[in-house]
Interface confidence: low
Amino acid sequence: WELTILHTNDVHSRLEQTSEDSSKCVNASRCMGGVARLFTKVQQIRRAEPNVLLLDAGDQYQGTIWFTVYKGAEVAHFMNALRYDAMALGNHEFDNGVEGLIEPLLKEAKFPILSANIKAKGPLASQISGLYLPYKVLPVGDEVVGIVGYTSKETPFLSNPGTNLVFEDEITALQPEVDKLKTLNVNKIIALGHSGFETDKLIAQKVRGVDVVVGGHSNTFLYTGNPPSKEVPAGKYPFIVTSDDGRKVPVVQAYAFGKYLGYLKIEFDERGNVISSHGNPILLNSSIPEDPSIKADINKWRIKLDNYSTQELGKTIVYLDGSSQSCRFRECNMGNLICDAMINNNLRHADEMFWNHVSMCILNGGGIRSPIDERNNGTITWENLAAVLPFGGTFDLVQLKGSTLKKAFEHSVHRYGQSTGEFLQVGGIHVVYDLSRKPGDRVVKLDVLCTKCRVPSYDPLKMDEIYKVILPNFLANGGDGFQMIKDELLRHDSGDQDINVVSTYISKMKVIYPAVEGRIKFS
Amino acid sequence: WELTILHTNDVHSRLEQTSEDSSKCVNASRCMGGVARLFTKVQQIRRAEPNVLLLDAGDQYQGTIWFTVYKGAEVAHFMNALRYDAMALGNHEFDNGVEGLIEPLLKEAKFPILSANIKAKGPLASQISGLYLPYKVLPVGDEVVGIVGYTSKETPFLSNPGTNLVFEDEITALQPEVDKLKTLNVNKIIALGHSGFETDKLIAQKVRGVDVVVGGHSNTFLYTGNPPSKEVPAGKYPFIVTSDDGRKVPVVQAYAFGKYLGYLKIEFDERGNVISSHGNPILLNSSIPEDPSIKADINKWRIKLDNYSTQELGKTIVYLDGSSQSCRFRECNMGNLICDAMINNNLRHADEMFWNHVSMCILNGGGIRSPIDERNNGTITWENLAAVLPFGGTFDLVQLKGSTLKKAFEHSVHRYGQSTGEFLQVGGIHVVYDLSRKPGDRVVKLDVLCTKCRVPSYDPLKMDEIYKVILPNFLANGGDGFQMIKDELLRHDSGDQDINVVSTYISKMKVIYPAVEGRIKFS
């Protein structure tokens, strides 16, 4: 019996087609993705093949002005229109709190939304009961398939799930649910979830009874053969894990941003054993037409956005590199731009001993969610900035000891190379890392722009000195694992909305051209 | 682990430079000392060496009209500006009574003020509590250093400390404090104090755990080798005392009146034992330029700034250091400002392959003729800029081979240190010089901001590549000895008036705050 699994993950509000790097579409003839194009391909496969499931592995929320304005209603509406069969909750589904998940999505979705390792407690338990499930048994042709969901246990550090949701270890939580499915004589089980490729592989290895793992969170691109676009495969598609009980378990993920549709064909024997698996992500490029009815609906929903966001704020004459491939690994000029805007927004020159009350900015690279292409006449709009800074946060002022900052910079690279969001972009700071040293001891130079000086220049960080720093509220609140900031900050003052800070700066500067100038170095 | 101790003692209100005999300066070209000159040397050493402490062994108070008028406020202000790490109380610090010490100095100093053998009693005890300390543990690089203070026990006979301060025997009082530091695992301890050379030597002999003694009060001049001025050495620098427990303890003092900066290098082993010590007082003569920002501050305190009366173009919140002492020797923020304006005035984004046609600026430091003080409400007028750029030149565009630029940068430092005008300020260039190499081979790194790129970043200069550069017409015409530019330029286009370029930029930016950010470095 053959099953076709179509899957998406980490779509991040890319309802419209995008450019190849998943930023705003500029040249339509070269654009990719978007729900209208996705629907065309899904329908084509549904017509051609008998047993098809369309699954999403989380993080539909957050990423463009669509989410800023519609706050998840757009996710429910268009996923319903595409007739998704199931979705797993991602960490970003909690970005607007539990209420921001329940009202627009959980109550409106016509498909099951799953997570086995999220347990509600307190007053939330009854309120959310039945709105998401640990698993769902779906009829597919003459057979049934069990879908069991999971969500990154790091979600409390990554989003805003509140205090009434407990995120358990994925493997610990999944096993009893899979066992339950087995007792229900469900012998074909897909784990669908959002915890990253490493955890996906562990689930494949450790959870007895899981036949296929469909993942997300790490934006992992897998491909067999010559990849069709710029993404470099992290492995073959599907990635085969040998489970502890000796089975070959296919693990898949489909990069991110709706650029690809994951396409996996699984052959089961009569006992539900996987006897073959093959496929590849399908690049949703312009050779696939956008479905006219979905496109018309998109255009209708777009009207509200256009009024909101299409005014030019200023111009860039350089590519504003906000890609995760840059900003999570090294100094990126988008990080420099944002930090420069953050400092500029905080000029308070009051005291002759100090050229300014604050000179430093830190910014988690993972908070930079999109690049901005300069080849659209250089125009920068609110919409562009909302894709870069989609989280609706604020840029806040904190006071920290030097020792806390040192810990923060150690944390920045404690697991360097895994494309994790804690890698810090900076302003008013020169940092040198030595990645050959052990985690926790990798910062070999940390110079900071003086404030108690008339000519700003860089001096070594002093462990016992108290410094003011501008940073995203997300970091002030300990996000991306920066617990030391939350625990050790001496003062915290809320600031202005992140997009507004950057848009004001760009409007003021008129033309911008930030460079990669050596703020962050590796020795 | 190596520690550099910079030290002064018995400065006695010599904030301005003095004649060779420490009286009022008459012929400026032969004058010495003063806080502006001291700051230049201190900063030079801080930049060059990793672990530096700047210490004062007392008697800053008393000696010139500065103390008569400002009553110690000048000491706090300028010692803060110089970023002293610690000071010991001298007898003269009590000349205006305890109140005359507490209000202007103890409450305003941003560095610890120390004395272990002064004990407060009665109502004074709570009032003065925490304002001076017996010792302070200072972080220096990755290590900590304990500084324990002492003051001449003769102070009640020499000054006006009142009845609520008890001056104990130095050795008796120091030992328990040193013992306390040892229990805190502080294994590198400096005794810093003001009791005279004989007591300094006794402390070195008798106080177990003291590694170095930095003294004052007796105006002792120590020197190894041929002394550089009129003072006759009382012994070698450092003076080595063998302690009762068999250790070699270096003892130093730096004459008086700010004429010398004591310079002592100590090498400690892992257990905090002194394994070597060497150095000499540095004569602060006119070969060392006075730091312009400190000098400007001195002049302000001395005569009050004139009000400017012309139109405001924009504001600066930093000191725009256009002094020859800076701009002819190192990166100066006035040079950075002007170069940034020159690039901004030449934004011509025409080709998708190039973010801009030009990214580089060079500017002879000798062409910057004045600083601009930010302490006039930050106001910048055309008149100010005309003082900076008085020659009515233009900022031009040239095309040069990389090899020509390399020659230009070699010329920039071919006779470095003579305050000659050819020292280049830059924009879009990162240069590293090694002045220990022979002239013509001093440029060890020359990275330039790419133009044929979508994200500007720094790449090594290529000898055979052709680059566009913005520079003053003076340089394009071979001025300041830049014959190679005149001889080898491939194209030269006249540009806009120099003052106008800068004034337009300042008007556009509204508020400026250029920094010294590492464009020019010395290895």
């Epitope: 470099v232 491939q325 697991r415 360097y416 190379g417 895994q418 050959s436 040293r437 | -």
Partner: antibody, heavy 120, light 106 residues
């Protein structure tokens, strides 16, 4: 999958120089340092140094400073090691190696090795 | 440079034996030690890093331990395919390897 494909064996005369190549595939070349390791016949391993393909920055074992020069060509995802003034002491198998994660060490991925023989 | 003194140079083993190799660092290297296996004509293979963490896919008969200056590598039950040279390596200060231990059949 991740592969490091090195150039073939070299027979060179004393005093000459040689350039060994290492073609990387299956991962983001610029994101990981490329290390080089020497193994003389029947001997242990000696770390030569590494180069960061992203910016061309390199770090050398002092023993090999002046002997080895490391370069990269990002466009072809290839790393190179140039060895100069060769003597019989330089006869060895030379490996390129990539770290597990972006560490300098913990070499999880190795080239197949290039035998360099220095002989008159 | 940190010197890694590896002992013994040779080990004669039979299938099923338990084997222990030691490496002593000339100064503390924390836990920044890796172990490699090299078979004739092949490139080395990473087995253990951070002194005790098994690299992906390495059988659990291979274990490592130690901290500071003394490190141990153990094969709990030697199999025929384990005959090879084993190297330790430190990455705490620059990067150096041990001289190697050759496992040979008795």
């Amino acid at each position: 999958q991740i592969q490091l494909q090195q150039s073939g064996p070299e027979l060179v005369k004393p005093g000459a120089s040689v350039k060994v190549s290492c073609k990387a595939s299956g991962y983001a070349f610029a994101s990981y340092n490329m290390n080089w390791v020497k193994q003389s016949h029947g001997k242990s391993l000696d770390w030569i140094g590494y180069i960061d393909p992203y910016n061309g920055g390199s770090s050398y074992n002092l023993t090999f400073k002046g002997k080895a020069t490391l370069t990269v060509d990002k466009s072809s995802t290839t790393a190179y090691m140039h060895l100069n003034s060769l003597t019989s002491e330089d006869s060895a198998v030379y490996y390129c190696a990539r770290g597990y994660g972006n560490y300098k060490a913990w070499f999880a991925y190795w080239g197949q090795g290039t035998l360099v023989t220095v002989s008159a | 440079d940190v010197v890694m003194t590896q002992t013994p140079k040779f080990l004669l083993v039979s299938a099923g034996d338990r084997v222990t190799i030691t490496c002593k660092a000339s100064q503390s290297v924390s836990n920044d030690v890796a172990w490699y296996q090299q078979k004739p004509g092949q490139s080395p293979k990473l087995l253990i890093y951070y002194a005790s963490t098994r690299y992906t896919g390495v059988p659990d008969r291979f274990t490592g331990s130690g901290y500071g200056t003394d490190f141990t590598f153990t094969i709990s039950t030697v199999q025929a395919e384990d005959l090879a040279v084993y190297f330790c390596q430190q990455d705490y200060s620059s990067l150096t390897f041990g001289a190697g231990t050759k496992l040979e059949l008795k």
